[in-house]
């Protein structure tokens, strides 16, 4: 033993639930990758707990995580991205719990950005466009996007559209006239890499035109 049990901390620690979850972000800062882990139980006492990753690394055997409040993270270029790594929670020199994880299966893309909606009067539709940093990446290039929109007054009535491109057309007739809409988008890996939905992009708000009484069409704002 490492001498950390003298005040009973280690015995107590073994009774706790140290289950944790992690996500990776590839090429998140130039060619640097990141790995972020956190305990699933927000009440776990993390004072002396550290995370370490070993295996499937370039040039090194293991890497230690840095701690930022209750989040543990690594930013490095040294992920091999082939095979499984062993991620362990440690106290002193003792491992409390470990997980074997392939970092390519826990990828969380960066949130899309520059979401905008343009009304085309002649076509009677709305063109939704957004951007993603993944278009420029070497690894996680192929994403599935989830565009969600709702009438602002409908708290939880979101309509979702899945698409692989960064452009979507919404038909005017499918939307309520003279209404304020909120729209947002998120992304998930869709080819080779697996993982989680990104954070949502910042929401964009747009108003649909009034109905033109003579023609039955909406007026643009």
């Amino acid at each position: 033993e490492s001498g950390y049990a003298q005040n009973g901390d280690l015995e107590d620690a073994e009774l706790d639930d140290y289950s944790f979850s992690c996500y990776s972000q590839l090429e998140v800062n130039g060619s640097q990758h990141s790995l972020t882990c956190a305990f699933e139980d927000p009440d776990v006492n993390i004072t002396n707990l550290e995370f370490e990753i070993c295996g499937a690394l370039v040039e090194v055997k293991c890497l230690n995580f840095r701690k930022l409040q209750e989040i543990y993270f690594i930013e490095t270029k040294k992920f091999l991205l082939i095979g499984k790594s062993n991620i362990c929670v440690k106290v002193g020199e003792k491992s409390l719990t470990c997980k074997k994880i392939d970092l390519t299966t826990i990828v969380k893309p960066e949130a899309p950005f520059d979401l905008s909606v343009v009304y085309r009067e002649g076509a009677n539709d709305f063109v939704v466009t957004f951007n993603t940093s993944h278009l420029q990446k070497k690894y996680v290039k192929v994403l599935m996007h989830d565009v969600a929109y709702r009438q602002e007054k409908d708290e939880n009535k979101w309509t979702h559209v899945n698409l692989s491109s960064t452009k979507l057309t919404l038909l005017q007739r499918k939307l309520q006239p003279a209404a304020m809409y909120e729209i947002k988008v998120r992304s998930i890996p869709d080819h080779y890499f697996k993982g989680f939905w990104s954070e949502w992009s910042p929401s964009y708000y747009f108003r649909t035109p009034e109905i033109n009484n003579s023609s039955g069409e909406m007026d643009p704002i």
């Epitope: 130039g30 060619s31 640097q32 550290e50 370490e52 370039v58 040039e59 090194v60 293991c62 890497l63 230690n64 995580f65 840095r66 701690k67 690594i74 930013e75 490095t76 270029k77 040294k78 440690k90 020199e93």
Partner: antibody, heavy 119, light 107 residues
């Protein structure tokens, strides 16, 4: 095998600028790692000065920040230290070393070069 | 800045002795600690990294323990080539700082 070798003048006059270069062989300074400068005044301990990251970004120790520039010449696989307005307190053995940032060690060091600040 | 308080600053020991050097960090640094050995006129040599891991090519008589704020370098059986100065160093936060050193001399 990674090797680092410091070079530069052994004597610098007070108020002038100290300039040192570290030549790296066996590994490209643009591939990975932080590339550091550390110094050791005569008979004293070690002091980390700063680094240039493989990406080109730099981080300096706050006590010397206003006087330091660390740069690199990727075509020669070298990185350099400039320390301005030197005084006798800057007399030391200067080492270059690889490591830090995402790893908790300096694994390869140069043999060190002695710089004396004197008129 | 994180202060690294190394003790003792010097010690005298004989070949075969067990030697322990401690390093106390002024705040918690997890495993972000390395130990180096330096001989006169030479560059420091990495012995231990991540507080407990032995660097490549380093004899197994060297070991590191601890995490958080209290760290120990142990030489289980001192050899003639081990008489040198030993430094700890933290990589947890900038500026990276070294301990003041421990000089191990022949008794």
């Amino acid at each position: 095998q990674v090797q680092l070798q410091e070079s530069g003048p052994g004597l610098v006059k007070p108020s002038e600028t100290l300039s040192l270069t570290c030549t790296v062989s066996g590994y490209s300074v643009t591939t990975d790692y932080a590339w550091n400068w550390i110094r050791q005044p005569p008979g004293k301990g070690l002091e980390w000065i700063g680094y240039i990251f493989y990406s080109g970004s730099t981080t300096y120790t706050p006590s010397l920040k206003s006087r330091i520039t660390i740069s690199r010449d990727t075509s020669k696989n070298q990185f350099s230290l400039k320390l301005s307005s030197v005084t006798a307190a800057d007399t030391a053995v200067y080492y270059c070393a690889r490591g830090g940032y995402d790893v908790n060690y300096f694994d390869y060091w140069g043999q060190g070069t002695t710089v004396t600040v004197s008129s | 800045d994180i202060q690294m308080l190394q003790s003792p600053s010097s010690l005298s020991a004989s070949v075969g002795d067990r030697v322990t050097i401690t390093c106390l960090a002024s705040q918690t640094i997890g495993y972000w600690l390395a130990w180096y050995q330096q001989k006169p006129g030479k560059a420091p040599k990495l012995l231990i990294y991540a507080a407990t891991r032995l660097a490549d090519g380093v004899p197994s008589r060297f070991s590191g323990s601890g995490s958080g704020t209290m760290f120990t370098l142990t030489i289980s059986s001192l050899q003639p080539e081990d008489f040198a100065t030993y430094y700890c160093q933290q990589f947890f936060s900038y500026p990276w700082t070294f301990g003041g050193g421990t000089k191990v001399e022949i008794k």
